[in-house]
């Protein structure tokens, strides 16, 4: 689903307050509710009628340093007999997320929100078809 | 997908430096990629075998100030004849995102990390069953 | 202006050969996956073909799979359908089609004008 634009108001104090100095914000350290977890179906990645793999990118300046990314492993859907229908479509689900990027310079450290799209996994469609018009 | 603990380390300066002040660091106004735009399947909740609604929830402190959750509408999955299908299972996807958590004190403002668990979509599995032993 | 011309069809006896072709223009063929479906009479659409764009990843409905071919000539930007031990249940109309998008799957397909009517009789 789609983040909207910040359009940086979010970001700024009150219209009543001194500006923000030298464009940076306060973030404090720590991350609420850290230790929630995905309680996802086990397998869901192959047992799933629109199977996908995974592949894991990895960047040590980025939180979380993981982004796991899932690639629809058909075109069609695996039917009942374990057959791939191409009458059906796997499509990816993509999510937007935001990751940290932390920018550094000697000891300066600074950090900034970075939108990244992910796929997350693969769902069985009907396909849609448009008819192109001959004039 | 899980985002590993930070352990905190991603946000401290490198040993040799000064620790950061009063637990907090610096983050830059704007946001990286975020023209970035999610390129997904028109209709899908409604297209899928496991198709799924949207509930919207929308909080002014935080950044997205909208987040989207994915419902499962179904138990089955939808089958070529338009029939819910319980030998197979719609079940959600779910992803661990994170979001910006402003706080502010009159002209004080500081921000902070949420993890947020997103049910992103649904897919259609063959369901697993387990043995229970009799002893 | 995306256009999808087939050709190639017509009567042929069971057990026969037919080789459809499809002209496309208005759109990059050579980045597209490109389609072969059919309606047969008072039936929807079935799809039974699927060819990568480039021409590795093949598809295959099982009704068809070992008697029909696909295949492409990017530089023509042309689409084949070689159909070999043909049956009367392969009457039909049939159609080329491309992905809606380019690069990213959605289920979305543009498919094209006529067809070409294929029918199987003794």
């Known amino acids: 689903r789609k983040i909207p634009k910040v359009g940086h108001t979010f970001f700024q104090k009150p219209e009543s307050c001194p500006p923000v100095p030298g464009g940076s914000m306060k973030l404090d350290i720590g991350i609420i509710n850290e230790n929630q977890r995905v309680s996802m179906s086990r397998n869901i990645e192959s047992r799933s009628t629109s199977p996908w793999n995974y592949t894991v990118t990895w960047d040590p300046n980025r939180y979380p340093s993981e982004v796991v990314q899932a690639q629809c492993r058909n075109l069609g859907c695996i039917n009942a007999q374990g057959k791939e229908d191409i009458s059906m479509n796997s499509v990816p689900i993509q999510q937007e997320t935001l990751v940290v990027r932390r920018k550094h310079q000697g000891c300066s450290v600074s950090f900034q929100l970075e939108k990244v799209l992910v796929t997350v996994g693969c769902t069985c469609v009907t396909p849609v078809i448009h008819h192109v018009q001959h004039h | 997908r899980k985002i590993p603990k930070v352990g905190h380390t991603f946000f401290q300066k490198p040993e040799s430096c000064p620790p950061v002040p009063g637990g907090s660091m610096k983050l830059d106004i704007g946001i990286i990629n975020e023209n970035q735009r999610v390129s997904m399947s028109r209709n899908i909740e409604s297209r899928s075998t496991s198709p799924w609604n949207y509930t919207v929830t929308w909080d002014p402190n935080r950044y997205p100030s909208e987040v989207v959750q994915a419902q499962c509408r179904n138990l089955g999955c939808i089958n070529a004849q338009g029939k819910e299908d319980i030998s197979m299972n719609s079940v959600p996807i779910q992803q661990e995102t994170l979001v910006v958590r402003r706080k502010h004190q009159g002209c004080s403002v500081s921000f902070q990390l949420e993890k947020v668990l997103v049910t992103v979509g649904c897919t259609c599995v063959t369901p697993v069953i387990h043995h229970v032993q009799h002893h | 202006e995306v256009q999808l011309v087939e050709s190639g069809g017509g009567l042929v006896q069971p057990g026969g050969s037919l080789r459809l072709s499809c002209a496309a223009s208005?759109?990059?063929?050579?980045?597209?996956?490109m389609y072969w479906v059919r309606q047969a009479p008072g039936k929807g659409l079935e799809w039974i073909s699927a060819l990568a764009p480039g021409g590795g990843n093949r598809y295959y409905a099982e009704s068809v799979n070992g008697r029909f071919t696909i295949s492409r000539d990017n530089a023509k930007n042309s689409l084949y359908l070689q159909m070999n031990s043909l049956k009367s249940e392969d009457t039909a109309v049939y159609y080329c089609?491309?992905?809606?998008?380019?690069?990213?799957?959605?289920?979305?397909?543009?498919?094209g004008g006529q067809g070409t009517q294929v029918t199987v009789s003794s």
């Open positions: 089609a491309k992905d809606h998008n380019v690069g990213y799957r959605t289920g979305e397909y543009d498919y």
């Open positions: 208005g759109f990059t063929f050579s980045s597209y996956w």
